[in-house]
Amino acid sequence: FVRTKIDTTENLLNTEVHSSPAQRWSMQVPPEVSAEAGDAAVLPCTFTHPHRHYDGPLTAIWRAGEPYAGPQVFRCAAARGSELCQTALSLHGRFRLLGNPRRNDLSLRVERLALADDRRYFCRVEFAGDVHDRYESRHGVRLHVTAAPRIVNISVLPSPAHAFRALCTAEGEPPPALAWSGPALGNSLAAVRSPREGHGHLVTAELPALTHDGRYTCTAANSLGRSEASVYLFRFHGASG
């Protein structure tokens, strides 16, 4: 097809002859992909480019966090004419190329997902040889990792005036609701701290004053499940008289 651009004075500016509608750089990635921790996810990425029938050397790259500057988590290179993209980098051995870059597909499989993988990922392709060109997705794909609650720490700590307090920290996505139960407590959603900076999936609940000996149980729950852990408080009571 032929696309003609005309300026306001009706002068012919330029005429571009296109053999197909895909003769420009573009990348197609979904805004977000969701998967459960421990499972696998696929980060889809396909692209179009202006270099017809390019079969020279190419490199496929995925980075995390931010475009252009974020750390690479995967890289592979295909030699001239080769359909095989030889993996050169796979962070922790968990990133695997599903797509065929020769067919404009850079889709990536991420295995054994962890909550720390919850971030944005950016695909990039580089052509070398006769043609030198490169393109990277600007907005990337957000990998949203969900997880059932897991209590990562539960402890009893001394507090002023010979008292004791209990802390329970759990992780999960969505962030779990924490509840304490124990002697003379019933069920209380005590003093939940907001997720800490840089630890968005961690939630802490404090029980400020343990007034009775016995078992104190912390329960963490979200839409994917629940988890429980307990601590025991037994104070030494000296003989009187």
């Epitope: 696998a40 996810a41 696929v42 889809p44 095989l84 993996t87 050169a88 051995g93 695997r96 889709s107």
Partner: antibody, heavy 121, light 111 residues
């Protein structure tokens, strides 16, 4: 031309051991994952084990029922993969196939002719 | 483990006719549009041969009369016009989750 050739099969008594070898040629061995798949006489296919390549830290994976008895390994300098089988049982009797898979896909694009392992007293 | 169930167990089709084999997974094997189901052909006395990978991609050197389709839990292998050399047992395999598992096989014969 891709070639995958298994050897080391034979008759072994229950409780015995056997080491299978798989020699490959015609492709860059270092670029691929290697697997063993078995087929009991007249039965279907069962995946046994996988070993990944250097980039993927030579990670190994096993069918749950076999883990602890079978060990997969590879020698890149010889383009060869091995399956060490210990504490063999009658139900391990099968043709053992060595297969190749791409780093991006756990499907088996080349298969050897297989080697028969018979566990019997 | 993901269980794959093939149907039918055996199939007799006239030469030139269409043969259809189904494979049902016990849970979804599709992620973000990628289906981790693969099909193999095994002739008597030979090792299996890859026909279709990731549900619908024809493996190298395989005739175009073979095709695959499906998503989620239900997949189909179709031989559009059965030839004498297609007599074999066909297996599906999943790589969605380890351990990789196979269907029990479907034997295709000439009617």
């Amino acid at each position: 031309e891709v070639q995958v050739v298994e050897s080391g099969g034979g008759l072994v008594q229950p409780g015995g051991s056997l080491r299978l070898s798989c020699a490959t040629s015609g492709f860059n061995f270092n670029d691929y994952f290697m697997n063993w798949v078995r087929q009991a006489p007249g039965k279907g296919l069962e995946w046994v084990a996988q070993i990944r390549n250097k980039i993927y830290t030579y990670a190994t994976f096993y069918a749950e029922s076999l883990e602890g008895r079978f060990t997969i390994s590879r020698d890149n300098s010889k383009s060869t993969v091995y399956l060490q089988m210990n504490s063999l049982r009658a139900e391990d009797t099968a043709v053992y196939y060595c297969t190749r898979s791409l780093t991006g896909g756990d499907y088996f694009d080349y298969w050897g002719q297989g080697t028969l392992v018979t566990v019997s007293s | 483990d993901i269980v794959l169930t093939q149907s039918p167990d055996s199939l007799a089709v006239s030469l030139g006719e269409r043969a259809t084999i189904n494979c049902r997974a016990s849970q979804s094997v599709t992620i973000s549009g990628y289906s981790f189901i693969h099909w193999y052909q095994q002739k008597p006395g030979q090792p299996p041969k890859l026909l279709i990978y990731r549900a619908s991609n024809l493996a190298s050197g395989i005739p175009a009369r073979f095709s695959g389709s499906g998503s989620g839990t239900d997949f189909t292998l179709t031989i559009s016009s059965l030839q004498a050399e297609d007599v074999a047992t066909y297996y599906c395999q999943q790589s969605r989750k380890s351990p990789w598992t196979f269907g029990q096989g479907t034997k295709v014969e000439i009617k």
